[in-house]
Amino acid sequence: KIDACKRGDVTVKPSHVILLGSTVNITCSLKPRQGCFHYSRRNKLILYKFDRRINFHHGHSLNSQVTGLPLGTTLFVCKLACINSDEIQICGAEIFVGVAPEQPQNLSCIQKGEQGTVACTWERGRDTHLYTEYTLQLSGPKNLTWQKQCKDIYCDYLDFGINLTPESPESNFTAKVTAVNSLGSSSSLPSTFTFLDIVRPLPPWDIRIKFQKASVSRCTLYWRDEGLVLLNRLRYRPSNSRLWNMVNVTKAKGRHDLLDLKPFTEYEFQISSKLHLYKGSWSDWSESLRAQTPEEEPTGMLDVWYMKRHIDYSRQQISLFWKNLSVSEARGKILHYQVTLQELTGGKAMTQNITGHTSWTTVIPRTGNWAVAVSAANSKGSSLPTRINIMNLCEAGLLAPRQVSANSEGMDNILVTWQPPRKDPSAVQEYVVEWRELHPGGDTQVPLNWLRSRPYNVSALISENIKSYICYEIRVYALSGDQGGCSSILGNSKHKAPLSGPHINAITEEKGSILISWNSIPVQEQMGCLLHYRIYWKERDSNSQPQLCEIPYRVSQNSHPINSLQPRVTYVLWMTALTAAGESSHGNEREFCLQGKAN
């Protein structure tokens, strides 16, 4: 009932709680002397469903049959309307429409850990929309029945707060859940299980790893488990991997040897436990243990390349370069590289340890036969040395690869292609493609990149250390025994017109012609490989088209003669530079007047 109902009553038949689809009779009746004061025939009783008027009647009582009520709670209010006054609330009633509970399904129980508590879950089925009480019962082998009730609206879980013991792990327990509301009751099918079926062990803890004699091949994983655990599964992976290695072990007693770990690798380890071969469930995975395996001596050999530079008639500079070993080859932190330089005929050898660099430069006589060996060392030992005989890499003209081309291939890639040398192509043992940023000064500090290609390949895609809008000097070497031939080309992955033209720094007169000198365009403004320079000139104050002279770009060139100027005429000169994408803006303008005699 909604309020004190002093003036009358609202009764509901058959009940305030009804099954969906049922009909109810609602009666509103006034108590004696509670009608309209002047004329009781004027009593007008009105029945509201929530705020909507659904029926009215003149007199002391009103009967209304109501059908089609929705699931949930519906509020009915009866009011009295008298002439010349507001409606007065008489009484009200709530009607609860719902359904009987469905049979609870999929009842299952679990105990987390040997010391945990038994809890069960089930599926309620469709919502009853009514207050429904669930009672969970558990009968055990000790002739005790446990019972717990739940009065939440959405009850599908109960914890008994007790702990099943493994005194007789094969003894049966039976659980059953019963749902009861005003419209009926329903019980689940009984669920019968043993201790071993429902106990889910706690995840293992205190995980440790030991490496005997600091060796990756003698590795044991240790952990602690609950007392009854029979099975474990281990999973482990390198920290940078998504794929797990899995191992199942029986009666491990908290230890297991791992035989397939890689050296100098951080691994993540996790363990899970189970009480029985085919009963029960696996525990959650343990917290991860992260550990790094010990180093082993490096495997593999360094990829070594070199560059020779003529210094003077008796000396040459040798620059050695090598690539880092891959992580799987280094098998530890590389502490230093050992470089040995030896003159083969005289047997003189010099060894040096290099730390922090992957290159080494030295000066040697131009005479003699020289060889180098380079190896990488970590705390456990050294890699096998890579041996190279120093030779003149471009000496054999007949070994020079032909028709070398370099073309942009997508973002920051250059496809280099060539034809085999004229000399017997089968003599080629390997090709080496080398590239470095083009610097007009021929700076030897510029990093060198290279890749090796099999003798039957006639192309290579270079992508390492390739930047857009930078010109690269690319060489293809064909190597055969102690001979080599090479061809070179310039290439870029992406280009556009240069950002500026060359800066003319001097114009000098020589025997009736002039020599123009300029400063190179800064590398970052070249925007790719330069193909040509253009020198423009025209008479000062003239509106005629300028004349021009186009010069093929050569790295070291920074002057050029022009002999078509008239004496005693003042000219304005400027320069531009071109890539395959177009021409730069003008460089600076210079005026010049040739002093020589007129022809």
Partner: nanobody
Framework: QVQLQESGGGLVQAGGSLRLSCAAS????????MAWFRQAPGKEREIVAG????????YISDYMKGRFSIDRGNAENTVYLQMDSLKPEDTAVYSC??????????????????????WGQGTQVTVSS
């Protein structure tokens, strides 16, 4: 020290009912569990029923299931044992027991009298045929 006081025992005819009550001198919330045990002459003490105070889990011997029930009623420090359809073999001294604090008890522990640490004097129930 928790004192437990049983009442409600007596003589009853077979098929009759009794309601035993156990009043604790401390609030029952301070206790982990309260239970009823019985001991017939010449027999061992056996569990009848109990209740875990915090979660409201009840436990009852399968021999008495359907005839006996345990509840806390409305009184904060009292538990009741409702006994219906009594039989002559239900004749025994009925004692109230309490466990003040605990970790999670096991199903075995909770049915054993030694697990409980406070006991009442007991009340006699006699069922005549």
């Amino acid at each position: 020290q928790v004192q437990l006081q049983e009442s409600g025992g007596g003589l009853v005819q077979a098929g009759g009912s009794l309601r035993l009550s156990c009043a604790a001198s401390a609030r029952t919330e301070s206790m982990y569990a309260m239970a009823w045990f019985r001991q017939a002459p010449g027999k061992e003490r056996e569990i009848v029923a109990g209740i875990i105070q915090s979660g409201g889990t009840t436990y009852i011997s399968d021999y008495m299931k359907g005839r006996f029930s345990i509840d806390r009623g409305n009184a904060e420090n009292t538990v009741y044992l409702q006994m219906d359809s009594l039989k002559p073999e239900d004749t025994a001294v009925y004692s109230c027991a309490a466990k003040v604090s605990s970790g999670t008890p096991s199903d075995i522990q909770i049915s054993q009298s030694r697990w409980y640490d406070h006991w009442g004097q007991g009340t006699q129930v006699t069922v005549s045929s």
